[in-house]
């Protein structure tokens, strides 16, 4: 969490941003809140990006003002106009690109004063893994697949029964470039699987960590997966 203040005492307002990550090809949110004002027409929101000449987005006098918008953001940004009055200056970013990564500044002016805060925005690709029993294999084998990752992640297998065991000798992981030539499909195969055990396939890069669990018993198979972004901290 980054909290920024305007300069000069009583003419400063608190602006808060949260570092976040964008999944390339999807929409992203750059989070920013501020002390609200009672009049929408008195609020100015400016989003800037370090190293970019034009503005990312500007909202003032109750409407978007995009005549100074940088080319890389044209047609790709929006504020939540109906929430500005309650202090939400968050920015929606369409079709996140790798090049959108960087340091952003949320700059606010209201009748109470000015304030700003920086936000670190990481971009990459991350997706939920799915673990299945591979019935085509000669021995009991598990297959963990996740469709989109970037940068290349690490894959680690773990098991409930053999806690602390190293499965690198009995697993094989491959990375297949997707059609857009950036993200990759992750496939990891675990051999010599025993029944009545829960196995976890953990995929991690510097942006996200995802786990796919599978519980294999004689009577049923149970699956569960979850994904966690690693760098959500506020300023």
């Amino acid at each position: 969490l980054i909290i920024g203040f305007g300069i000069s005492g009583r003419h400063s307002i608190t602006v808060t941003t949260v570092a976040s990550a964008g999944n390339i090809g999807e929409d992203g949110i750059l989070s920013c809140t501020f002390e609200p004002d009672i009049k929408l027409s008195d609020i100015v929101i400016q989003w800037l990006k370090e190293g970019v000449l034009g503005l990312v987005h500007e909202f003032k006098e109750g409407k978007d003002e995009l005549s100074e918008q940088d080319e890389m953001f044209r047609g790709r940004t929006a504020v939540f106009a109906d929430q500005v009055i309650v202090g939400n200056a968050s920015l929606r970013l369409k079709n996140v690109q790798l090049t959108d990564a960087g340091t952003y500044k949320c700059y606010i002016i209201t009748s109470k004063g000015k304030g700003n805060a920086n936000l670190e925005y990481k971009t990459g690709a991350f997706s939920m893994p799915e673990v299945n029993v591979d019935y085509n294999a000669s021995s009991e084998t598990l297959r963990c697949e996740a469709p989109r990752w970037f940068p290349q992640p690490t894959v680690v297998w773990a098991s409930q029964v053999d806690q602390g065991a190293n499965f690198s000798e009995v697993s094989n992981t491959s990375f297949e470039l997707n059609s857009e030539n950036v993200t990759m499909k992750v496939v990891s195969v675990l051999y010599n699987v025993t029944i009545n055990n829960t196995y976890s396939c953990m995929i991690e890069n510097d942006i996200a960590k995802a786990t796919g669990d599978i519980k294999v018993t004689e009577s049923e198979i149970k699956r569960r997966s979850h994904l966690q972004l690693l760098n959500s901290k506020a300023s």
Partner: antibody
Framework: QVQLVESGGGVVQPGRSLRLSCAVS????????VQWVRQAPGKGLEWLGV???????DYNAAFLSRLTISKDNSKNTVYFQMNSLRAEDTAVYYC?????????????WGQGTLVTVSS | DIQMTQSPSSLSASVGDRVTITCKAS??????VSWYQQKPGKAPKLLIY???NRYTGVPSRFSGSGSGTDFTLTISSLQPEDFATYYC?????????FGQGTKLEIK
């Protein structure tokens, strides 16, 4: 209320150029992009290009070499110029305004202006 | 370019019927799909934007759904004024593209 009015259509000879105007009112140029879409007789819609608030443009690659979109902020008017016209460019040409700054659809359309390419 | 394939290309229905038109994108387009109604000699009218948001003034019988590659426009109870041609369009990536249209006729 928001209005877009196209003008400049008519009969154009093959190989010649076409210049259309789109006069807008009821919204500011500085907030929204203006799109150009055409529709050949009895056919579907085809996107041609857009001019953004900043004046920068994006074009359908199929028309890149012969299309120019510009605007005059003082006149609240967008201009569309297409060169080297051929018979298959015969269509109704529309200008339209985005529904949101993030372009989730085209909310307001002009009435359209018919361009016929014929000798 | 992203292809938007609409189906059916035409359909006959009666007043009061529930009608569904589908649109399939050749690649993922998130929720950047809009639906338009067009009557002969008139400009298209926006019905749905962002896949599921009904545009201002559009009757509640029109609804949109879907994300990724599969999208649907539903008219819950056809009214006489709904007989027209309907188009889907994507504004996710350039060039923006439209479906070939669905002509809705009176049975």
């Amino acid at each position: 209320q928001v209005q877009l009015v196209e003008s400049g259509g008519g009969v154009v000879q093959p190989g010649r150029s076409l210049r259309l105007s789109c006069a807008v009112s009821g919204f500011t140029f500085s907030s929204y992009g203006v799109q150009w879409v055409r529709q050949a007789p009895g056919k579907g819609l085809e996107w041609l290009g857009v001019i953004w608030s900043s004046g920068s443009t994006d074009y359908n690659a199929a028309f890149l070499s012969r299309l120019t979109i510009s605007k005059d902020n003082s006149k609240n008017t967008v201009y569309f110029q297409m060169n080297s016209l051929r018979a298959e460019d015969t269509a109704v040409y529309y200008c339209a305004r985005d529904v949101t700054t993030i372009v989730e659809g085209f909310a307001h359309w002009g009435q359209g202006t018919l361009v016929t390419v014929s000798s | 370019d992203i292809q938007m394939t609409q189906s059916p290309s035409s359909l006959s229905a009666s007043v009061g019927d529930r009608v569904t038109i589908t649109c399939k994108a050749s690649e993922k387009v998130g929720t950047y799909v809009s639906w338009y109604q067009q009557k002969p000699g008139k400009a298209p009218k926006l019905l749905i934007y962002g896949a599921s948001n009904r545009y201002t003034g559009v009757p509640s019988r029109f609804s949109g759904s879907g994300s990724g590659t599969d999208f649907t426009l539903t008219i819950s109870s056809l009214q006489p004024e709904d007989f027209a041609t309907y188009y889907c369009g994507q504004t996710y990536s350039y060039p923006f593209t439209f479906g070939q249209g669905t002509k809705l006729e009176i049975k």
